[in-house]
Interface confidence: medium
Amino acid sequence: FSPLRRISIKILVHSLFSMLIMCTILTNCIFMTMNNPPDWTKNVEYTFTGIYTFESLVKILARGFCVGEFTFLRDPWNWLDFVVIVFAYLTEFVNLGNVSALRTFRVLRALKTISVIPGLKTIVGALIQSVKKLSDVMILTVFCLSVFALIGLQLFMGNLKHKCFRNSLENNETLESIMNTLESEEDFRKYFYYLEGSKDALLCGFSTDSGQCPEGYTCVKIGRNPDYGYTSFDTFSWAFLALFRLMTQDYWENLYQQTLRAAGKTYMIFFVVVIFLGSFYLINLILAVVAMAYEEQNQ
């Protein structure tokens, strides 16, 4: 080994070197949080870039650049360092027009913390491994969601458009004339029944166990779906989104109540199956895979 390489190895393995890099990254992060940084911070930026360049040079001299098994670019963590340095010089010395977009990449410097702190490195490694292992579970999840989305599509297509429509129309009004003039939320409130504080018209259904309309209102299929049109089973994609919402239990009880009011209480069976299979089983299966990957990484 050449003397330069020997010195580089000694520096690289020294604990103070790791400490210096860690402190530099943390200080750099603090400076990045500044809203309106003063002019002198520009010089500090150059200092940080210089330290990162020095770190990479030491690593390259000690391990080699890319030829060989344990060289600098063979370690994916060093790719991050390399990208950080390249962007640092690009934003500083090359006029690329929209520099602010490139300056966003400075945030990558914060990610350098991962490669320096061993515990974080393990967690991120486990995360990457779990993503690889999750592919099968994800395929199963998407398949299950798709199957239930298709069932939902068949059972509830158009149901969430059922609304309680006012019977006592003016003599010259017709359903068509009303639908042509409905523009604002106020227009809707004039013809449909709204519960106190509700932003959507009262849902109803045509089966005996579905929601009924109050006196003076008739259940009709008209207008848009609830929640600004985002909650429905009218197409496969909307049904899939609704099923994903059930799986993640994202305000799922509202979707459950809306659907049961429009379709009938019998359909609670559908929701019980979806919640048990999707929310309890599949979510825990995903968690189990992540836990296994983390355990493997630790060993």
């Epitope: 297509m157 158009g158 149901n159 059922h162 429509f165 019977n167 006592s168 129309l169 017709t174 359903l175 068509e176 045509f206 006196e215 003076g216 209102y217 008739t218 259940c219 009709v220 299929k221 008209i222």
Partner: nanobody, 124 residues
Framework: EVQLVESGGGVVQPGGSLRLSCAAS????????MRWYRQAPGKQREFVAR???????GYADSVKGRFTISRDQAKNTVYLQMNSLRPEDTALYYC??????????????????WGQGTLVTVSS
Amino acid sequence: EVQLVESGGGVVQPGGSLRLSCAASGRILRIGYMRWYRQAPGKQREFVARITGGSATGYADSVKGRFTISRDQAKNTVYLQMNSLRPEDTALYYCEALVTASVRGGSIHSGTYWGQGTLVTVSS
């Protein structure tokens, strides 16, 4: 497909009575309001009477006190009892209904449907 069929029209003398009926058929889930309209030769269609899902009624000023609208929910039928008929009541009488029905493919549709009309002639 939802169909509205009017019946009961005919020729009647002034001061006489007639009872028109309008029956809705098809895969009907619910009927909202039902209305009667009329169109005299060379004139525009005008509103006659209406009945809501809750059986509230409304009439045109020209027929108030003479005509009575009623409905049979079970038979999906609306009736128009016309008393003290006048020559100016001569027209083709149509019924209109807001119907929610199950259409092809099992989907549900709401819309207003019209009958073909029944002719009422009041003349001596």
